[in-house]
C-alpha cells in the first residue's frame, strides 16, 4: 500500500522534521505551510487549520518561503549618484548601485548604501590601480620617462615620446617636445 500523504497541518513523527516549504509551529505543535515569496502569514496555523497567506503590500517584499506576519519594507529610493539595478517588487528588494564614475564607499547586504566619486589623478600622477564597484582609484607619481597631463580617474602614466632631437624635455606632467627638422 502506498504511504499516506500528510496534509498540513499535521503532527510530525517523533524525531522527524517538516517537509520542504513547511515549518514546525511550536504553539500548534504541527507542521504547517510556509507562504511563498511575495506573501506573508496573515493567519498562523492551528491544530486544524493551515497557515493563511496574503500578498505583500506595495513597497514591501518577501524573498523566501516564510511565515513572517509582515513583509519587509523595500529600501528607500536610489539617490542621485546611484542607478536602480533591481526594482522593488513583492518578491525582491530594490537594489541601488553606483553610477559610472562613482564607487561604493559603504555597502549593504545587496547594493550600495553610500556612493563616492572616483578619485581623479592630477597631472603628474597616473592611475596605479583602477577603481572598481567597491574600491577607489589609487594614483601614483609618474616615474621618470613617463607622464600624465590630465586630471583623470582612468588615465595611466604614458612614456614620453622619443625624439631624435629634444626641444623641451618631458617631465611627469608633460610629454617631451621634439625638434622638427626642416628639409
Amino acid at each position: 500500500l502506498p504511504a499516506q500523504v500528510a496534509f498540513t497541518p499535521y503532527a510530525p513523527e517523533p524525531g522527524s522534521t517538516c517537509r520542504l516549504r513547511e515549518y514546525y509551529d511550536q504553539t500548534a505543535q504541527m507542521c504547517c505551510s510556509k507562504c511563498s515569496p511575495g506573501q506573508h502569514a496573515k493567519v498562523f496555523c492551528t491544530k486544524t487549520s493551515d497557515t493563511v497567506c496574503d500578498s505583500c503590500e506595495d513597497s514591501t517584499y518577501t524573498q523566501l518561503w516564510n511565515w513572517v506576519p509582515e513583509c519587509l519594507s523595500c529600501g528607500s529610493r536610489c539617490s542621485s549618484d546611484q542607478v536602480e539595478t533591481q526594482a522593488c517588487t513583492r518578491e525582491q528588494n530594490r537594489i541601488c548601485t553606483c553610477r559610472p564614475g562613482w564607487y561604493c564607499a559603504l555597502s549593504k547586504q545587496e547594493g550600495c548604501r553610500l556612493c563616492a566619486p572616483l578619485r581623479k589623478c592630477r597631472p603628474g600622477f597616473g592611475v596605479a590601480r583602477p577603481g572598481t564597484e567597491t574600491s577607489d582609484v589609487v594614483c601614483k607619481p609618474c616615474a621618470p620617462g613617463t607622464f600624465s597631463n590630465t586630471t583623470s580617474s582612468t588615465d595611466i602614466c604614458r612614456p614620453h615620446q622619443i625624439c631624435n632631437v629634444v626641444a623641451i624635455p618631458g617631465n611627469a606632467s608633460m610629454d617631451a617636445v621634439c625638434t622638427s627638422t626642416s628639409p
Epitope: Q26, T27, V43, T46, K47, T48, P69
Partner: antibody, heavy 119, light 106 residues
Framework: QVTLKESGPTLVKPTQTLTLTCTFS??????????VGWIRQPPGKALEWLAH???????YYNPALKSRLTITKDTSKNQVVLTMTNMDPVDTATYYC???????????WGQGTTVTVSS | DIQMTQSPSSLSASVGDRVTITCKAS??????IAWYQHKPGKVPKLLIH???TLQPGVPSRFSGSGSGSDYTLTISSLQPEDVATYYC????????FGGGTKVEIK
C-alpha cells in the same frame, strides 16, 4: 467598534468552580483568524495568560493550569466561557478576556472582572 | 515554557527623559513580542506588536527593537501621561507576560 465584557461571580469559595463569560461585539468567532483568550492579574502582580480559543475551536491552555481550565465558545451568542475548577485564595485576581489576532497577539481587552476567593 | 524576564521592575524618570525597558526570553522567540501599557483602573493597551510595529494611534515616541531573545521598549521623551505599568508579551510559543515595569515621574 470591538468591545469585550467579562461577567461572573465576584466571590467564590475555595474548592468551588469559577465560571466566567466573555461577551463580545464588533467581530465574530466564525471569522477566519479570530480568537479570544483569558488573562488574569492577581493584586500587585503581573499579567498571566490562562487559555485561548480560535475560530476553528482549537484551544490552548497555560501548561501550569491546564488540568483546571476549560474554554468553550458559543459563536451564535458571541460568547466565550472559561471554567476554572478547585479555586484557591491564590486565584484571587482581575480576570480579563481579550481578542486575539490571526498572528497571535491580544489587540483589544475587556474591562476585567474582579474575583475574590475566600471562605 | 518560555520565561520572560523584564527589567527594571520599576523606574522613576523626569519628563523628557529617554526611558528603556527590556525583556529577555528564555529562548529565541523570533520577534514575536508585544508591548502593553496598563494604567491603574484602565484596560491594558496594545502599543507594539511583532517587536517594532506601532499600533495605530500610539505616539511615535514609543518604539520597539530586538531579535532572538532580547527585546527593548523605548520611550524617547517621557510624558506625564506615560505613567503606567508596561508589560511585554511573548507569543512565539504559547503566551507569556513579563513581570512588568512601573514607570513613574520624578
Amino acid at each position: 467598534q470591538v468591545t469585550l465584557k467579562e461577567s461572573g461571580p465576584t466571590l467564590v469559595k475555595p474548592t468551588q468552580t469559577l465560571t466566567l463569560t466573555c461577551t463580545f461585539s464588533g467581530f465574530s468567532l466564525s471569522t477566519l483568524g479570530m480568537g479570544v483568550g483569558w488573562i488574569r492579574q492577581p493584586p500587585g502582580k503581573a499579567l498571566e495568560w490562562l487559555a485561548h480559543i480560535w475560530w476553528d475551536a482549537d484551544k490552548y491552555y497555560n501548561p501550569a493550569l491546564k488540568s483546571r481550565l476549560t474554554i468553550t465558545k458559543d459563536t451564535s451568542k458571541n460568547q466565550v466561557v472559561l471554567t476554572m475548577t478547585n479555586m484557591d485564595p491564590v486565584d484571587t485576581a482581575t480576570y480579563y478576556c481579550a481578542r486575539m489576532t490571526g498572528t497571535r497577539y491580544f489587540d483589544v481587552w475587556g474591562q476585567g472582572t474582579t474575583v475574590t476567593v475566600s471562605s | 515554557d518560555i520565561q520572560m524576564t523584564q527589567s527594571p521592575s520599576s523606574l522613576s524618570a523626569s519628563v523628557g527623559d529617554r526611558v528603556t525597558i527590556t525583556c529577555k526570553a528564555s529562548q529565541n522567540i523570533n520577534k514575536f513580542i508585544a508591548w502593553y501599557q496598563h494604567k491603574p483602573g484602565k484596560v491594558p493597551k496594545l502599543l507594539i506588536h511583532y517587536t517594532s510595529t506601532l499600533q495605530p494611534g500610539v505616539p511615535s515616541r514609543f518604539s520597539g527593537s530586538g531579535s532572538g531573545s532580547d527585546y527593548t521598549l523605548t520611550i524617547s521623551s517621557l510624558q506625564p501621561e506615560d505613567v503606567a505599568t508596561y508589560y511585554c508579551l511573548q507569543y512565539g510559543v504559547l503566551w507569556t507576560f513579563g513581570g512588568g515595569t512601573k514607570v513613574e515621574i520624578k
